[in-house]
């Protein structure tokens, strides 16, 4: 096909691919009609003057995963039709000024995963049509003012995984068309007020895995179109009352892995589209009334691995659409009987790894659709009569690792469990802790007559007498709560995120991968 180099493969569709360690220079001659050229996994160390001079019709050029460390300024001369240029995964430390001159059609420029130490305004001053600029995975320590001033059409900018310690409030001011800005995995400690004010079309802002301690109150006030805001794994200790007030389009907000101690009522200002809120791994100690009341469409609320010891009865007001509530691994000792009353659509609740010593009889009174309740590893000695009676959809109930007191008061619970064993699972059953003569025996099969009778012996009313068996042998995969495979963090929907770890760590929020969205 018009002279394909021996070390390359050329297709009818004008696509050329040159790969292999034996390649040490750009192969020649390249087909004059080539529209796509890929040079991958070679030992090319430099690009000299005009190696692509005779393929002026080229639209896409990928020079990736090579040993490339030096580029001559005129390397891309005569590529006026080029729309896509990737130099990702090379060893570039310096970009020559004028390298991209003449690339008037360039829309996507990928410079990620190199060793770039700095960028200058002159680097991109000719790239007025650029829509996407990927600079993540370099060694950039600062971005000079004016670096992006000519990129007025830019819609996606990735500066993640660099060494940025601060950002000038003026650096993004001309990027009015920007939709995605990623600054994750840097060393930012604060973001100056006004930094994002010019980004009126921003839809995604990724600031996770920095060292941000404080958010300015009006930091996001101009970003009315923001849909995804990632603030996880920073050092944020408090949220200014108005910080999220102007974000009506937000549908994803991650705040896990910070140092938040409290959440003030109304902090999550009207966010009618927010479906998930991740707040695990903070230092939250209490939840006041109405703290989530603006989140009318919230379906997943993750508050696990905090230090919550008190939940106000109205803390979950407004969460009428909530499906999953994770409160595990906190310091809860008591729960008000009305605390879950508003959660009419709740399906799964994780309360394991707390210090709950008793539950009010009406705790699940209005939550008729509950399918899974995790209560293991608490301090429960008994449960109130009829606490699960009305939960016809309940198919997973975890009660093990509690100090069950197997005196005659336990009989109603024991009888109900006996009739509803499929709900308990087969892996681990609840065992008696006291009296000592029955310690370690299964609560379900214990002969209560051997146990010491309690001081107060009630009549033995019944939990539901009809055995309940689920229609299917296992909980449907789409809503499973079997705590087997979980995400350590929500998948932050990146096409260019390189590591999304899935682990078997059964500790994040007591629910499965399927529920993480």
């Amino acid at each position: 096909y018009h002279g394909c180099p021996s070390e390359c493969t050329c297709s009818r569709a004008s696509q050329v691919e040159c790969t292999g360690a034996r390649i040490v220079a750009v192969p020649t001659p390249l087909p004059w009609n080539a529209m796509s050229l890929q040079i991958l996994n070679t030992h090319i160390t430099e690009l000299n003057e005009s190696p692509f001079l005779n393929i002026s019709a080229l639209i896409a050029l990928r020079i990736e995963k090579n040993e490339l460390s030096r580029i001559t300024p005129g390397a891309f001369r005569n590529l006026g039709s080029l729309r896509y240029l990737s130099l990702a995964n090379n060893k570039l430390q310096v970009l020559p000024i004028g390298l991209f001159q003449g690339l008037d059609s360039l829309e996507s420029l990928l410079l990620s995963s190199n060793q770039l130490l700095q960028i200058q305004p002159a680097h991109f001053s000719q790239c007025s049509n650029l829509k996407e600029l990927q600079l993540h995975g370099n060694h950039l320590e600062y971005i000079p003012d004016g670096a992006f001033d000519h990129l007025v059409g830019l819609t996606k900018l990735n500066l993640g995984k660099n060494s940025l310690t601060h950002i000038s409030p003026r650096v993004f001011q001309h990027l009015g068309n920007l939709q995605v800005l990623r600054l994750y995995e840097n060393r930012l400690t604060d973001i100056p007020m006004g930094t994002f004010d010019g980004l009126v079309n921003l839809q995604e802002l990724a600031l996770q895995q920095n060292q941000i301690g404080l958010l300015s109150p009006g930091l996001f006030h101009n970003n009315h179109n923001l849909q995804r805001l990632y603030l996880s794994n920073n050092h944020i200790s408090q949220l200014p009352p108005s910080v999220f007030m102007q974000l009506p389009q937000l549908n994803r907000l991650t705040l896990f892995g910070n140092s938040l101690k409290e959440l003030s009522p109304g902090i999550f200002g009207p966010m009618p589209n927010l479906r998930e809120l991740w707040l695990y791994d903070n230092h939250i100690s209490s939840l006041p009334d109405n703290v989530f009341s603006n989140l009318r469409q919230l379906q997943v609320l993750i508050l696990s691995r905090n230090q919550i010891s008190f939940i106000s009865p109205g803390a979950f007001n407004g969460l009428t659409e909530l499906r999953e509530l994770s409160l595990h691994t906190n310091a809860l000792q008591d729960l008000d009987g009305n605390v879950f009353r508003m959660l009419a659509n709740l399906q799964n609740i994780s309360l394991q790894n707390n210090r709950l010593r008793q539950l009010p009889g009406n705790i699940f009174a209005n939550v008729n659709g509950l399918m899974a309740i995790q209560l293991q590893n608490n301090q429960l000695e008994n449960l109130p009569l009829g606490i699960f009676d009305h939960l016809g959809k309940l198919c997973e109930l975890r009660l093990y690792d509690n100090p069950w007191r197997c005196d005659s008061d336990i009989l109603p619970l024991r009888n109900w469990l006996l009739l509803n064993q499929p709900r308990l699972g087969t892996d681990t059953v609840p065992v008696c802790f006291s009296p000592a003569n029955v310690r370690g025996q299964s609560l379900i099969i214990i002969n209560v007559n051997v146990a010491v009778p309690s001081v107060h012996v009630p009549e033995v009313p019944s939990y539901p007498e009809t055995p309940w068996y689920p229609d299917t042998p296992s909980y449907p995969d789409t809503t499973s709560v079997s705590s087997t495979t979980e995400l350590t963090s929500p998948v932050e929907d990146y096409t260019d995120l390189t590591t999304i770890q899935v682990t078997d760590d059964r500790s994040v929020w007591g629910m499965t991968q399927a529920q993480s969205g």
Partner: antibody, heavy 120, light 112 residues
Framework: EVQLVESGGGLVQPGGSLRLSCAVS????????VHWVRQATGKGLEWLGH???????NYNSALMSRLTISKENAKSSVYLQMNSLRAGDTAMYYC??????????????WGQGTTVTVSS | DIVMTQSPDSLAVSLGERATINCKSS????????????LAWYQQKPGQSPKLLIY???TRESGVPDRFSGSGSGTDFTLTISSLQAEDVAVYYC????????FGGGTKVEIK
């Protein structure tokens, strides 16, 4: 007779890790929980964590990132894995259980301890 | 975490005399619903493993001599040895289990 026997102590390099074992007899790990507690020479007791009969674990928050407690019921053994060791981890390490006490977090049967020394 | 502070650090008492050890917690250990104080006392003799003496602030473990008694509620607790015996020479620790357990620093009891 109820017994808990710790093993696995010894000299460990700073930055290294250790895996201590607690072999129990006279009771089943499917019925009883086990705690780990340590004590530096001449110092007080420090609770490290526990594992309950069903396998749930809790940890001292200050050490959580470096600790893992696990068990093998069939082998009647509980394990303490500790990483990134430093000189301050030098101590006698005990395992204990709640055999008779009515206190769920009470520790009324203890092993004799195993000594861990972290030094280069 | 709940911090447990014991006083005094050490105590010398004549045989047959009363020994009193105090323990203060940084927050209340009383659960209002169970009406229990989640505080225990342990004794550790030289070269031995600790031994549980008292739990729920005032309930003596079986086999513990009645000269040992515990009292207090909320944040302030006391272990009393009404008539000190030679075999009571030991370090005494309080421990809270209201939240995940933490021990006090210990009080050394010696014979004067």
């Amino acid at each position: 007779e109820v017994q808990l026997v710790e093993s696995g102590g010894g000299l460990v390099q700073p930055g290294g890790s250790l895996r201590l074992s607690c072999a129990v007899s006279g009771f089943s790990l499917t019925s009883y929980g086990v705690h780990w507690v340590r004590q530096a020479t001449g110092k007080g007791l420090e609770w490290l964590g526990h594992i309950w009969a069903g396998g749930s674990t809790n940890y001292n928050s200050a050490l959580m990132s470096r600790l893992t407690i696990s068990k093998e019921n069939a082998k009647s053994s509980v394990y303490l894995q500790m990483n990134s060791l430093r000189a301050g981890d030098t101590a006698m390490y005990y395992c204990a259980t709640h055999m008779i006490t009515e206190d769920y977090y009470g520790m009324d049967y203890w092993g004799q301890g195993t000594t861990v020394t972290v030094s280069s | 975490d709940i911090v447990m502070t014991q006083s005094p650090d050490s105590l010398a008492v004549s045989l047959g005399e009363r020994a009193t050890i105090n323990c203060k917690s940084s927050q209340s250990l009383l659960n209002s619903r169970t009406r229990k104080n989640y505080l225990a006392w342990y004794q550790q003799k030289p070269g031995q493993s600790p031994k549980l003496l008292i739990y729920w602030a005032s309930t003596r473990e079986s086999g513990v001599p009645d000269r040992f008694s515990g009292s207090g509620s909320g944040t302030d607790f006391t272990l009393t040895i009404s008539s000190l015996q030679a075999e009571d020479v030991a370090v005494y620790y309080c421990k809270q289990s209201y939240n995940l357990p933490t021990f006090g620093g210990g009080t050394k009891v010696e014979i004067k």
